[in-house]
Amino acid sequence: TNQCTVRYNVADCSHLKLTHIPDDLPSNITVLNLTHNQLRRLPPTNFTRYSQLAILDAGFNSISKLEPELCQILPLLKVLNLQHNELSQISDQTFVFCTNLTELDLMSNSIHKIKSNPFKNQKNLIKLDLSHNGLSSTKLGTGVQLENLQELLLAKNKILALRSEELEFLGNSSLRKLDLSSNPLKEFSPGCFQTIGKLFALLLNNAQLNPHLTEKLCWELSNTSIQNLSLANNQLLATSESTFSGLKWTNLTQLDLSYNNLHDVGNGSFSYLPSLRYLSLEYNNIQRLSPRSFYGLSNLRYLSLKRAFTKQSVSLASHPNIDDFSFQWLKYLEYLNMDDNNIPSTKSNTFTGLVSLKYLSLSKTFTSLQTLTNETFVSLAHSPLLTLNLTKNHISKIANGTFSWLGQLRILDLGLNEIEQKLSGQEWRGLRNIFEIYLSYNKYLQLSTSSFALVPSLQRLMLRRVALKNVDISPSPFRPLRNLTILDLSNNNIANINEDLLEGLENLEILDFQHNNLARLWKRANPGGPVNFLKGLSHLHILNLESNGLDEIPVGVFKNLFELKSINLGLNNLNKLEPFIFDDQTSLRSLNLQKNLITSVEKDVFGPPFQNLNSLDMRFNPFDCTCESISWFVNWINQTHTNISELSTHYLCNTPHHYYGFPLKLFDTSSCKDSAPFEL
């Protein structure tokens, strides 16, 4: 018998070193995967049993010949994948019976030449992949054929020229995609694209196109249906007004010019592309943008300038420059990405004219933006900006009123900087619609009572690892944030807080408080008693208190937190938990108590929270394997549907001595049965 796996109507026989077709698969399979084997042929008679096949994938084998009768035997075959084989010849007969094929993949074979008309009968073919074959011509037949073809992939061949007579077989086709990437193209002969019925997308990445050849290409695309043109990874070192001029009689909407080592964007380079909506200039070497660089892009919606500019070298003169008003023509631009650049700073009119801009990403963009002032973003005053990403810019100070121009801003990301200051609250002045402020991973933030007084709309506040100080002031810095749903105060080594820290945050759903030092606050011996900072958080869903050194949980600290779905108390020093502390957590879905010092798991503590649990993590606790300590737990484990990962390996007895290292779940509770308190 074979080792194929069969699921529903799909048989997977891949990676089995097969040298012949299995003959004992179910006869009703519709998909057969034979990839990565040692097949040399696909004998038609071996497929007689599998006449329902719709998809046959025989990629990554050593097939050197295809018998025409295969498709006769498989009348319903729609997808035939023969990529990475050893086919060198395909004749008029090879696919003659494959009239119902919709997809044919012949990528990575050794088909150097297409003789006569092997695809003449493929009137249903919508995708044909002949990439990586050593073809020197695009000619796949004489006379019009492949009238339903939508994707023709000819990348990584040896095509030197595009000639009209070699593309006329596509005269009735509407190609959604023609991929000629990674071909050493040197010539676009007159009318070469006019012979194709319709061409919507052309990919010519990595095709060694220089500016002159690009200009010639664009003229040949004139008066075609082209909408998407990808010219990434060529050697388009400079563009001028003439480079794309041939595209003025098209409705081009997408243009990819990434990875071109583009240095000089000449004035008016895009002036003939009024329909363009998407432009990528990622990973280039642009020295300067001037006020006319983007002239004519009156409909552009998306512009990526990620790593588009010159990299900084020793000479300061090499800093790229964005002149004032460089973006002034882009009145419909909604998304601008300028990540990973070496721009010195913003100027007073850097972003002027971007009156539709909603998303602006400036991560690792600037070299001299240490201080944000109320002038930094003045050029965005007329932009309806919703999201601003300022991560990784070495920002150390935010001045009052910095964001006062951004009244519609919803998300502000200032994470991964070097901000060290006292937050007076005036930094956020004018952010009347703000939804999220991300400040995590900064140097030092000192809070005051008014730190967030001006942003009552805030729903998410992230303050992870910012060496947070003054958290214990009263009234609480968070008191104005009545709409807050997520608060992250983790990794701050917080040791002192007041009971009213979160008072009034009735909408809080997620509280991240892990990696702090709250142990003293929950001790019975704490002067003034334990600090119950969770009271009133009636809508709290997720609570993370991992790694806080906790060795006690006060009674009543989780009282009335009925909506809690997840509690993480892992990596603490908890040992004996008080009865009834989780009584209100009957809706709990996830409980993490891993790496504590828990020895016993008793019903009066864990009964309520275990009722509806999906996931429990109590690994690496020193369980005491006695009836009193764990019989209830073991019985529960053995009848629950809760997911308990690594139960066999990481739930081990620690005591008594003779049970040391013994898997908890194998503990025999039958001798405990007569102890009434431990019954299920």
Epitope: N9, V10, T30, V31, A54, I55, D57, K78, V79, N81, T99, N100, T102, E103, D105, K123, N124, I126, E147, N148, Q150
Partner: nanobody, 115 residues
């Protein structure tokens, strides 16, 4: 990802007619081969009819001459019109599209022909 939803099944008298519909989301029918299959209790799933990008159609011998498969690309819908129905046409009818090298199936619609 293509989602297929069949409708139009139900109880029909022998000799009656029925029109099944299959709506696709995620990929228009104009770019794939679309078929109707059926599965009677305890039997394997069999082809009823199929329509190709070219408009070509194929039918199982058992329904030839009394069934028509058609499609409306604008509505992303393929239809199966069945006439002169027989008790042996009772089955769950499934819609099928093969696209991007994947075999997509609907949940099926029950057709019962009573004599």
């Amino acid at each position: 990802e293509v989602q297929l939803v069949e409708s139009g099944g139900g109880l029909v008298q022998a000799g009656g007619s029925l029109r099944l519909s299959c709506v696709a989301s995620g990929s228009p029918f104009s770019i794939g081969a679309t078929g109707w299959y059926r599965q009677a209790p305890g039997k394997q799933r069999d082809l009823v009819a199929e329509i190709y990008p070219s408009g070509d159609t194929i039918y199982a011998d058992s329904v030839k001459g009394r069934s028509t498969i058609s499609r409306d690309n604008a509505k992303n819908t393929v239809y199966l019109q069945m006439n002169s129905m027989k008790p042996e046409d009772t089955a769950v009818y499934f819609c099928n599209v093969v696209r991007w090298g994947v075999d997509y199936w609907g949940q099926g619609t029950q057709v019962t022909v009573s004599s």
